[in-house]
């Protein structure tokens, strides 16, 4: 991605998705009535004009918010602790990689706006998720709906990362 973001960052993201999948405790089929449209801001991750700073910022904020969401007492009560610890460790590693990268990208002069704007949008989105959990009294189905939602948004975000990586590869080979 034009900085020292390790090649294994994509692998770490994939591992995070696997962990989130393994964390599942009940079938989503039991939770049809609890589903909610959290309105993930897809326009943020589906654009074709991808800036390095934007991609880094989206990924960083996503991972930071996921870390916070799954790093609470409520979360510890809801999920398998071994898997939760693995999730925390993986997210922490990815955040460290991204922070190194973000510093470099900002140093290269990419706009601060590209970094602050996605962060605010994502904070609002995650706030909606927290409100939903509280409304549903942190029920098993509420956590299951949230787990699925986090997987959806993380999948879209890592896809955006892959698109930028392949764009960089194309530029490098031309």
């Amino acid at each position: 991605l034009g900085c020292d973001l390790p090649q294994n960052h994509g692998l770490l993201s994939r591992n995070t998705l696997v962990l989130l999948h393994q964390m599942r405790r009940i079938s989503p089929f039991l939770c049809l009535k609890d589903r909610r449209d959290f309105r993930f801001p897809q326009e943020m991750v589906k654009g074709s004009q991808l800036q390095k700073a934007h991609v880094m910022s989206v990924l960083h904020e996503m991972l930071q918010q996921i870390f916070s969401l799954f790093h609470t007492e409520r979360s510890s009560a809801a999920w398998n602790m071994t898997l939760l610890d693995q999730l925390h460790t993986g997210l922490h590693q990815q955040l460290q990689h991204l922070e190194t990268c973000l510093l470099q990208v900002v140093g290269e002069g990419e706009s601060a706006g590209a970094i602050s704007s996605p962060a605010l949008t994502l904070r609002r989105y995650f706030q909606g998720i927290r409100v939903y959990l509280k409304e549903k009294k942190y029920s098993d189905c509420a956590w299951e709906v949230v787990r699925m939602e986090i997987m959806k948004s993380l999948f879209l975000s890592t896809n955006m990362q892959e698109r930028l990586r392949s764009k960089d590869r194309d530029l490098g080979s031309s």
Partner: antibody, heavy 124, light 107 residues
Framework: QVQLVQSGAEVKKPGASVKVSCKAS????????INWVRQAPGQGLEWMGW????????GYAQKFHGRLTLTSNSSISTSYLELSGLRSEDTAVYYC?????????????????WGQGTTVIVSS | DIQLTQSPSSLSASVGDRVTITCQAT??????LNWYQQKPGKVPKLLIY???NLEVGVPSRFSGSGSGTHFTLTISSLQAEDFATYYC?????????FGGGTKVEIK
């Protein structure tokens, strides 16, 4: 890559029961829900029910209640469909299908991997 | 039960044509709709999940749209391998139900 392999074709008499198996192999998770869908000759698809092999949670389409039993043995990654009181209109290809897309997208209500189908013929 | 009505039930088209198939639900199903393709004697294959998301490996000429009760599957430029039957499926409520299918034939 996940694969679902189903048991062979069956010919049954009206009133009899049939049991179809569906074995998962490859990169499987025991928590994955297995759905059953059937297709009568020249007709469309009909959803019958689902089961989670891990928790044993199960759901049936009302139409099949009392006749359909979905079971599983997670130690051998196999799910089963048993349909009793067979009638000629149960003649169909029966498919098992894993809930979820082929990659981990968080979408669990799409049927992303299908078994090859088991033909069940009910005839006197 | 939620009924899904697909139209047309069959259509004839040529390679390169733009093809649109619609799926109408008897009640609001939000965005909870998938599309499948089935070729004669073959197993159904997931094309599009949750209205508009392309399954991995599905060509970008396929697209889905809609919400509520009205959904469409579009093939922007029909290819020889696209001649098949297409089914929509809702998962708003149990029992999950499929549309009756749309058979796309060669003109």
């Amino acid at each position: 890559q996940v694969q679902l392999v189903q048991s062979g074709a069956e010919v049954k008499k009206p009133g009899a029961s049939v049991k179809v198996s569906c074995k998962a192999s490859g990169q499987t998770f025991t928590s994955d829900d297995i759905n059953w869908v059937r297709q009568a000759p020249g007709q469309g698809l009909e959803w019958m029910g689902w089961r989670n092999p891990n928790t044993q949670d199960t759901g049936y389409a009302q139409k099949f209640h009392g006749r359909l039993t979905l079971t599983s043995n997670s130690s051998i990654s196999t799910s089963y469909l048993e349909l009793s009181g067979l009638r000629s209109e149960d003649t169909a290809v029966y498919y098992c299908a894993r809930a979820g897309t082929s990659t981990l997208t968080g979408h669990y209500f799409a049927l992303g991997v299908w078994g090859q189908g088991t033909t069940v013929i009910v005839s006197s | 039960d939620i009924q899904l009505t697909q139209s047309p039930s069959s259509l004839s088209a040529s390679v390169g044509d733009r093809v649109t198939i619609t799926c109408q639900a008897t009640q609001d199903i939000s965005k909870y709709l998938n599309w499948y393709q089935q070729k004669p004697g073959k197993v159904p294959k997931l094309l599009i999940y949750e209205t508009s998301n392309l399954e991995v490996g599905v060509p970008s000429r396929f697209s889905g749209s809609g919400s509520g009760t009205h959904f469409t599957l579009t093939i922007s430029s029909l290819q020889a391998e696209d001649f098949a039957t297409y089914y929509c499926q809702q998962y708003e409520n149990f029992p999950f139900t499929f549309g009756g299918g749309t058979k796309v034939e060669i003109k």
